[in-house]
Interface confidence: low
């Protein structure tokens, strides 16, 4: 009497994950009765994937009915195939018992799971950073199979070299992930900077998949502040403009105070932007000298981004001659500033 | 593909009665057999699986109350003690459920619980 | 245990009209799609419609329709015929193997 054959003619299948994969399964006869289960893995600790005999398994289906005559084909399509599926397939038959014994096993086939890696996630610094800091953006993706990936940074379309890449586990595993840390430099005109993180992966097609992060959420330009003093109107009041420039985010917060009592306090909002994405902003004081016995000291203080203030200060000086046309000048550029005025 | 029962009849409480299950047009080996069984004017209600080899099982409110055995052919359903709550029609159906649905079905068998 | 109630107890329509049943699982059915519709007529061995939550059976008419997934299923005749007027019932599947339990089953009366 010839011997049963269990004949699993693949020795490997590759398959994307989300489609169905087909193990196939022939046995040379139908004696002895007994029914074909299948196995991922070997020895004690094997999973049970598919028991023609009996039992629910939802994703497997056979690819032939196990009730027709004469059936000898007892391969499956396992639906929906995902990396945690890969492993080694083996096809046994059993003779039928109480309980059904184990007779003979195929040779096995290797399903191999090719996973698209997710969408790269970019996240930035917490906390913004000005001009010549260096922050570190992160780009992260997962799921994928084969462990074989590319990952690469762009600034502007410029590539970025200090990237530090690590894909996850070591071994072997049904998928991977990778993280990257790429460490970039700020300028004052990065606001509308953006950094790229581009993965690569064989079941892209050559169509990478990008994630993006602007640097307007990382950056911050502080405002350069330059307080003048316009002439002297004819009815003793002298009109003092505080100019804030150049400074990003919007948010800000400008106070101004006559011998460090608050005068007036503004918030910015709706400004209109400039081309580099920055921000420019004035507000004009209006002092009446005669009102004053005493010099006054003009203080205009701005609150940037919930940074420490910084003030830029005038001294307005009265005198004996009040009417006295100022000049249009302006306070040095530097924290905290007077000028007298007379 | 067919399945037939046979057995049903009017019998005592307490009185053992088995019930057949007749295949034909497919293998016992493939599939198993579930009995169903409608009270009058009640609905339906899944009693038990005869599988192949020793897999049999029973719905919760059955195990005790009933017993399954097969042959290469037939399948029998056995009532242990019945009582007059057992009074249906009893079905058998090829199929475990779920992606091997019961289909077909047998016309029935009539079993009259009665003192 | 698993617990399939089903709606309405009884329904009427018109030949030509919709017909709709429903039956929710007190928790998800196996693999979400362990449910089956049966047609039942008096006198009859029930008919297996639909399987697998949404799988037509063999020579069942297209007018059948399963839909629904984990708890919630629904049985729908479009273009009702004299033909149809049975009872039908669901059958789910829990986890468990021996967790097949029918619904109450819906009378559907044909005008």
């Known amino acids: 009497e010839e011997e049963l054959q269990v004949i699993q003619p693949e020795k490997s299948v590759s398959v994307a994950a989300g489609d169905s994969a087909t193990l196939n399964c022939t046995v040379s006869s139908l004696i002895p009765v007994g029914p074909i289960q299948w196995f991922r893995g070997a020895g004690p600790g094997r999973e049970l994937i598919y028991n023609l005999k009996e039992g629910h398994f939802p994703r497997v289906t056979p690819v032939s009915d196990p009730t027709k005559r004469n059936n000898m084909d007892f391969s499956i399509r396992i639906s929906n195939i995902t990396p945690a599926d890969a492993g080694t397939y083996y096809c046994v038959k059993f003779r039928k018992g109480s309980p059904d014994v184990e007779l003979k096993s195929g040779a096995g086939t290797e399903l191999s799971v090719r996973a698209k890696p997710s969408a790269p996630v970019v996240s930035g610094p917490a906390v913004r950073a000005t001009a010549e800091h260096t922050v570190s953006f992160t780009c992260e993706s997962h799921g994928f199979s084969p462990r074989d990936i590319t990952l690469k940074w762009f600034k502007n379309g410029n590539e970025l070299s200090d990237v530090q890449t690590n894909v996850d586990p070591a071994g072997k595993s049904v998928s991977y992930s990778i993280r990257s840390t790429a460490r970039v430099v700020l300028t004052r005109r990065d606001v509308h900077s953006q950094v790229i993180c581009e993965v690569a992966h064989v079941t892209l097609q050559g169509d990478p998949l990008r994630g993006t992060a602007n640097l307007s959420e990382a950056i911050r330009v502080p405002p350069f502040l330059e307080v003048t003093q316009q002439s002297m109107r004819a009815d003793n009041q002298v009109n003092v403009t505080c100019q804030v420039t150049k400074f990003y985010p919007q948010r800000l917060q400008l106070t101004w105070l006559e011998n460090g009592n608050v005068s007036r306090t503004e918030m910015a909002s709706a400004l209109p932007e400039n081309k580099d994405g920055t921000y420019n902003w004035t507000s004009w004081l209006l002092v009446n000298v005669s009102a004053h016995r005493d010099d006054v000291k003009l203080t205009c203080q701005v609150e940037h981004d919930g940074q420490p203030a910084v003030n830029k200060s005038f001294s307005v000086k009265v005198s004996a001659h009040p009417k006295e046309q100022g000049s249009n000048t302006a306070a040095e550029n530097t924290g905290t500033n007077e000028r007298n005025i007379y | 593909r067919s399945v037939e029962e046979s057995g049903g009849r009017l019998v005592t409480p307490g009185t053992p009665l088995t019930l057949t299950c007749t295949v034909s047009g497919f293998s016992l080996s493939s599939h198993g057999i579930s009995w169903v069984r409608q009270a009058p004017g009640k609905g339906l209600e899944y009693i038990g699986t005869?599988?192949?080899?020793?897999i049999t099982y029973f719905a919760s409110w059955a195990k005790g109350r009933f017993t399954g055995s097969k042959t290469s052919t037939t399948v029998d359903l056995k009532i242990t003690s019945p009582t007059t709550e057992d009074t249906a029609t009893y079905f058998c159906a090829r199929g475990s459920a779920w992606n091997d649905p019961f289909d077909p079905w047998g016309p029935g068998t009539l079993v009259t619980v009665s003192s | 245990a698993l617990v399939m109630t089903q709606t309405p107890a009884s329904v009427s329509a018109a030949v030509g009209g919709t017909v709709t049943t429903k039956c929710q699982a007190s928790q998800s059915v196996y693999g979400n799609n362990d449910l089956a519709w049966y047609q039942h007529k008096p006198g009859q061995p029930p008919k297996l419609l639909i399987y697998l939550a949404s799988t037509l059976a063999t020579g069942v008419p297209s007018r059948f329709s399963g839909s629904g997934s984990g708890t919630q299923f629904t049985l729908t005749i479009t273009g009702v015929q004299s033909d149809d007027a049975a009872t039908y019932y669901c059958?789910?599947?829990?986890?468990?193997?021996?967790?097949?339990?029918f619904g109450g089953g819906t009378e559907v009366v044909v005008k």
């Open positions: 005869i599988g192949t080899g020793v």
């Open positions: 059958l789910g599947g829990g986890d468990d193997e021996a967790d097949n339990v």
